[in-house]
Interface confidence: low
Amino acid sequence: SQVSQNCHNGSYEISVLMMDNSAFAEPLENVEDAVNEGLEIVRGRLQNAGLNVTVNASFMYSDGLIHNSGDCRSSTCEGLDLLRKISNAKRMGCVLMGPSCTYSTFQMYLDTELSYPMISAGSFGLSCDYKETLTRLMSPARKLTYFLVNFWKTNDLPFKTYSWSTSYVYKNGTESEDCFWYLNALEASVSYFSHELSFKLVLRQDKEFQDILMDHNRKSNVIVMCGGPEFLYKLKGDRAVAEDIVIILVDLFNDQYFEDNVTAPDYMKNVLVLTQSPGNSLLNSSFSRNLSPTKRDFALAYLNGILLFGHMLKTFLENGENITTPKFAHAFRNLTFEGYDGPVTLDDWGDVDSTMVLLYTSVDTKKYKVLLTYDTHVNQTNPVDMSPTFTWKNSKLPNDITDRGPQ
């Protein structure tokens, strides 16, 4: 049966899937508020452009009957459930916002002909790469693998003079949705990361990880894991760590490292943290202690999704183009729009680009300091601290294989 799009004659709607299974445990009313705040900004921008149109959101709530675990691992059917609701209501907006779970998004793509754009705050997995009408507003796993390969190969920086080609990956299956798919991408034998490494082993048990820290026969000095400092401490505690071990802690959606009064705990000295730049407006601010950084990023992605919808609406209306065409559905990529925190760039496949930041713990100040930044848009590493006060010998990152001799 034909679903009519509420997307013409001066009235434009975005359908927002409100799913109990979401990438981050954010109350749905907060997501709704983020959407509404975004709509207000969009209305103002359209009005300023002289476009006298109505913009609204319709919220589609799932009943959670089939899938009540509340996490993304049980979300495969939920997106389709909601699509069925839309189909029964015979009403659809110009754009679909959601779902955020990789399983849901993948399944919806598999089972439906999506002739309208879909915007997701999540869908991190490789299986959601290269989808022609999907836009992802939080860094997908593919971007992480590009950074890691780029960084592994780098050997011409004062603090990194060896190319690396080996790694351990710690993945115990209890990770958050973003970490689950980031590590999944590193584990997958077909991924870019696996393809470029000569040795990679996934550690699945706490004991495996703990043993590697002092194992003289280890095959790599580098361990990649995902989560926050507390997660690492639970695993590592105050155990001794060999001096040439480097732990890469992926913690993209966490601004706590940039707080003025944060001191790095001692167990972080062998760790490089990969996070994202919180933006200029936030770098100099004093964060309150009760900041919930992941929720901030998730809600911000929803708000930016609405702003993206507004941007595309404005562009098409100003050019006198039809909104309900395949051209509109495929247009949400290869562009920059004004997000809530500044410009947001989407790549050729509709995935958000960002500045990733690699931090180290200064042995002098016990503060997190920026070692380098990485621009995902141009796949380029930019060193920031040319003389880092590392814990590692000679203030240089060690070779990834101990005593391999000169290269």
Partner: nanobody
């Protein structure tokens, strides 16, 4: 820290109008909202009106239809137009700013004057409004 300075208070007769202003300076970053609060003698501070960055206004029931909050982002100034003033409006009026540092910075419900937690908010020194015949 944002520096907020209120002005426009004074003594006024019931039924008359008054306009308060609040000039913000210093680091403002990305804010959730700004608002006006008041504290009558011997009472707790209460929300009067708030306005989000995009201009959505919310009012306490006691002032709805009488007070109007507005802002001029280019001048970094907040206003409160108070009409049909009553004796019970007598209080010290404070300007406040809730910034993105707040945990739920994206939740405009948090910005409603009835629900706004007072933690993580920057305050002005206050300006006194006395409604008396």
């Amino acid at each position: 820290q944002v520096h907020l300075v209120e002005s426009g208070g004074g003594v006024v007769q019931p039924g008359r109008s008054l306009r308060l202003s609040c000039a913000a300076s210093g680091y403002t970053g990305r804010r959730l909202c700004r608002g006006w609060f008041r504290q009558a003698p011997g009472k707790e501070r209460e929300g009067v009106a708030t306005i989000t960055l995009s201009g959505r206004a919310s009012y306490a029931d006691s002032v709805k239809g009488r007070f109007t909050i507005s802002q001029d982002n280019s001048k970094n100034t907040l206003y409160l137009q108070m009409n049909s003033l009553r004796a019970e409006d007598t209080a010290v009026y404070f300007c406040a700013e809730v910034r993105s540092a707040d945990a739920e910075w994206l939740n405009p419900l948090k910005c409603h004057p009835d629900r706004l937690g007072l933690a993580g908010v920057d305050w002005g020194q206050g300006t006194t409004v006395t409604v008396s015949s």
